[in-house]
Each structure stands twice: as structure tokens, then as C-alpha cells.
Amino acid sequence: IRAEKAMVDGSWLDLAKRSKLEAQPFAHLTINATDIPSGSHKVSLSSWYHDRGWAKISNMTFSNGKLIVNQDGFYYLYANICFRHHETSGDLATEYLQLMVYVTKTSIKIPSSHTLMKGGSTKYWSGNSEFHFYSINVGGFFKLRSGEEISIEVSNPSLLDPDQDATYFGAFKVRDID
Amino acid sequence: IRAEKAMVDGSWLDLAKRSKLEAQPFAHLTINATDIPSGSHKVSLSSWYHDRGWAKISNMTFSNGKLIVNQDGFYYLYANICFRHHETSGDLATEYLQLMVYVTKTSIKIPSSHTLMKGGSTKYWSGNSEFHFYSINVGGFFKLRSGEEISIEVSNPSLLDPDQDATYFGAFKVRDID
Amino acid sequence: IRAEKAMVDGSWLDLAKRSKLEAQPFAHLTINATDIPSGSHKVSLSSWYHDRGWAKISNMTFSNGKLIVNQDGFYYLYANICFRHHETSGDLATEYLQLMVYVTKTSIKIPSSHTLMKGGSTKYWSGNSEFHFYSINVGGFFKLRSGEEISIEVSNPSLLDPDQDATYFGAFKVRDID
């Protein structure tokens, strides 16, 4: 029986470890600056890194600019978006800016898109200063179903800071759905 | 066999509980305002509380102004940094400020420092208002190895809000590395 | 013995699953805009949704405008608060605003209230622009005891953005207390 108990313990340790890792999908995606759209209107950002530098993904999928949920659960979602302008980049079309981020969820089964989180600020970036910067951070806890997709929309994408420490979003599973 | 099963269950419950606690390092460090550097340039903040008020630490180490990882894993890192100025504190050398935070990771084995997250804003804190305030929040999910160190750099440290609810940073382990 | 082992495994899987779910309280509460107080002074926000749209709660209680902890543990707390003003809403009493959030903890046993996190900014919302917007995000990791209550205070509540993606707060349990 002792040997049997050891076997039970051993198999359980493996199972517990394995199931724990399998049960915890995550992603941290950083902006791919080689393909940032221009313009000042709200656009969906589709180019993100998932496997270089700080970017990583496990048990989720990145496809067509969207983070796809592979496993039902409650997830903590977050985004950090930095905007910046230097006078050497040229004159702004307007000094009154609306710098915004929208974290949206799309369900394939019911083709619909909903905003989970938004953040940002109106800014007056006057010519009196040669450099301007502003960051937004949002985060929240959401129920996500397999197949649902998370995407990021921003205003004024041409002002995005392309650094991996500046503009990113991510998710990690916290618990199963009852 | 039933007694044996109860023993297995009991030992497993202990093991599961114990391993769960051991597997979840965390820290929440609050600013130690008795030792904030002056100056307007970017500096590393080295004085933080780890055991008073809201500050706490478990299975991580705080040493030489850095939060040291003791256990490999994926962690959620966060920082909240508040800046403030009241006219009674004196005149600002410039009304055009760059209020920034940088959350950095240093690896001892490969002596190098990298910024994981940054946030902030350029601000114009004019003399027309007697009080100014601004807060930054950043957060993200990162793979950390034992021995790696997390530190906080800010610009204009003399403007930091010294309250424990205002200026703090932290981390908690979410999952093991596969 | 194999059948016994299978029974052990099976019961353990149930127990592990059940205990894991029971051990992970959470809440995501969104602003109830039908009952936002007026004024510019700091007020406690008492009207939140807990069961519609993105709002949800499990193993925590929402009562009298406060989020009540039912289970000791370490929790990650967060809040996202959006303020906005459009000229069609009327003139602001002052263009110099202090837009702030305070996440507070109240202990019933020792009747006292303490601020866990604060964030915000002073803003100059001039009449030169027809629309103004600003969002605050705060988050942190805190030890909470059963019976303790979390509440949200803001300045200028009449400027709150009433959308569920804009103004919300929440919590999820990360680990037990040792």
C-alpha cells in the first residue's frame, strides 16, 4: 500500500502540476511598429509581437491582429498605451488631441463587438514645447469564452510610442468558470 | 484502504495547501519619503517600505533598493506613482515637466538593465494654479527568474507624493514557468 | 487497488476543482449612472451594478455601496474611473479641476477607513475645447479580511463617464493568507 500511496502521490503531483500549467493561459503582446496605421481616427491595431523581447503567449492564439481565447475562464486583461510627439516629426494637424484606447471583445458565434475597457485623455499639445508624451493604462477582470477575441483600438495611431515597454496589452487566466 | 485513502487525502491537502502558498511570492512596496532624492533627471528610487502599513513581502527579497526574485515564474508587476506640487513648496525651475516612471529588470548573471514598462506624461504646471497633481499607473505580465531584480526609476523625484496610497509598486506570482 | 487509486484520483480532482473555485472570490462592479451624486467635492460612490453587462460577483458581497470581503486572502484590487465634459452639458463652475479617485478599506470591527490607493490629476478644462476627457487607473495587491469593505470615492462625481467600460472597480483573490 505504501508503494501504491507513493504512486498516487507521484501521479497526483504530475497531474496537479500539469493541470495547473494547462489551466493558466496568458499573453503579453507588444506593438509592432513596422506596421502602425496613420491618421487620427479610431483604428484597430493589428500588428503585435507575441514571441520577441517581453512578448509571449501560451494557451492563447494571436491571429489577424486579435488575441484569441482558447480556454473558458475569468481573465485579468490589461493594456498600456503610450503616445508621443517630437517637433522633429513635423507639425501636428491639430494641437487639441483625443488620445484614447479601447479594449474590445468580439464573439465569432454572435458577430458582435463590445468595449470592455476604455481610457485616455484629451490633450493640448502646444507648439511651446518640443516634446509631448502621455500614457494610458487600463485593466479589468472579465469572463472570456473559447473563441472570443480581444483587440485594441486607439485614436491617433501615428502618435504611438513604438517601444515594447510603452505600448502593449495582455491577459492571464485567474480562474475557471464555475 | 479507507484509512489509507484518508491519509492520502490528508497529506495531499497539506501538500497542496503548502505548495500553493510557497508557489505564490508577492510584494507591495510603498515609498519611504524620508529618503527621496532631489533633482529633475531620471533617478532610481531605492528607499521603500516592505513591512509597515500596506507594505508587505513574501518569498521575495527587498535589498539595496531592489525587489529581488527568489522563485522563477510569471509575475504580474505594477506601479502607481503620484507627483504633486503646491506653491508653498517653492517655485518650480520649469513649468514644463516630464513626469515619468520606468519599471526595470536587472539580471545579475548578465549585468544588464532593461525597461519592462514605462508610463507618464509631459505636463505644464503653470503658476495660475496653486496645486498640481498627476498619477501614473503601469502594469504587465512578465517572466522573472530567480536572482533578477526589479527597480523603479522616476523623473522629478522631488515632486513625488510620499503617501503609501500614492506611490508604490508590487508584484505577485501568477504561475510557474513550463 | 487500482479502482481505489482511481477513486482517490477522482475525489481529489473534484476536491481540487471545488476548493480552487471556492478559494477565488472576485468582483467587477460597473457604475450605476442613474444615481450619481452631484457636486465637486469628494464623495463615496454607492451605486454600482454587480450582475449586468460586464459586472459580476462571486464569493464576495455588494451591499450599501460597498464591496464586502467574505473570505480572508490577498487580493488584487483595481479601479478605472473616467471623467468627461461636453460643452452641451453646460458651463463648468471652474476650469481648474482636481479629478481624483480613492480606493478605501473600512473595517467594521475597528470602525475606521483607510485609503489603499489613490490616483488622478489636476486638469485645466478650458472653454477653447468643446469636449474634455480623462481617465484614471489604479491597482494594487492587498491583504483583506472577511468583513472588511472596499469603497470608491471620487471628486467631481457629476463629471463621471457612465459607461460600463469607463467607470468600474473590482477585485480578485490571488492567494490565501499564510
Epitope: H86, S129, E130, F131 | S38, G39, S40, H41, S89, G90, D91, L92, A93, T94, E95, Y96, L97, Q98, S126, G127, N156, P157, S158, L159 | -
Partner: nanobody
Framework: EVQLVESGGGLVQPGGSLRLSCAAS????????MGWFRQAPGKGREFVSF????????YYGESVKGRFTISRDNAQNPVYLQMNSLRPEDTAVYYC????????????????????WGQGTLVTVSS
């Protein structure tokens, strides 16, 4: 790497005028508080003038008050030092530096409070 570049120096007769310029590159210092100092041969670095980021506050060394004026463009770079009624004792290498403090302290006239010095520009006042 941060660089400050001073220019505008030269040879001028007593009573004449010069306008020095200090431009920053490599990082956004356009709105930092700045200071001018000078160093005559065989002497220490002497405070000349200070200006805040907005240009709203200025200070001068006793020896140049009423003759020198520090200014900055409404928009950014550079910082200027207009020198009138020049005297032979104004002969020196003139340097600009970035004030390192967030608040204006009583030590604004000390060179140790400044960073990122340029190479300097030589002003010679002689007939």
C-alpha cells in the same frame, strides 16, 4: 548622448554687444531651466545668469546686472544671452548648463547644480 552647444562668441570692442546662443540636442532639454556661467583664464567658473523653463523668472550675477539679458524663445530652443556694454573684464569662455533641480533653490548660482556642460564659446573684449 546629451549635448549642449554654445555659439555666438568672438572679438568685440569695449561697449559693444554680442548675443550668445545655447542649443540642446540628444534629449529634450528645451524646457529645462538653464544657466550661463563664464570662466576667465586662471579663475573659477562664475555665475552669469539663470532662466526658468517658461522664461518667467530670471536671475543675474552682480557683475552683469543691467547689462546682460537672458531669454528663450516662446517655443523651445535655444537659450540666449544678450550681452551689452561689454567690458574687458567680461572676457572669458562662456558655458551653458542644464539646471538639475526641480525646484529653484538658493544654490542656482553654483555650477555644481548644473549638468551637461557644452564646450563653451570664447568672448574677448578688447580694443
Amino acid at each position: 548622448e546629451v549635448q549642449l552647444v554654445e555659439s555666438g562668441g568672438g572679438l568685440v570692442q569695449p561697449g559693444g554687444s554680442l548675443r550668445l546662443s545655447c542649443a540642446a540636442s540628444g534629449r529634450t532639454f528645451s524646457r529645462s531651466a538653464m544657466g550661463w556661467f563664464r570662466q576667465a583664464p586662471g579663475k573659477g567658473r562664475e555665475f552669469v545668469s539663470f532662466i526658468t523653463g517658461s522664461g518667467g523668472t530670471t536671475y543675474y550675477g552682480e557683475s552683469v546686472k543691467g547689462r546682460f539679458t537672458i531669454s528663450r524663445d516662446n517655443a523651445q530652443n535655444p537659450v540666449y544671452l544678450q550681452m551689452n556694454s561689454l567690458r574687458p573684464e567680461d572676457t572669458a569662455v562662456y558655458y551653458c548648463g542644464v539646471y538639475r533641480r526641480t525646484y529653484i533653490s538658493s544654490t542656482y548660482s553654483e555650477s555644481s547644480e548644473y549638468d551637461y556642460w557644452g564646450q563653451g564659446t570664447l568672448v574677448t573684449v578688447s580694443s
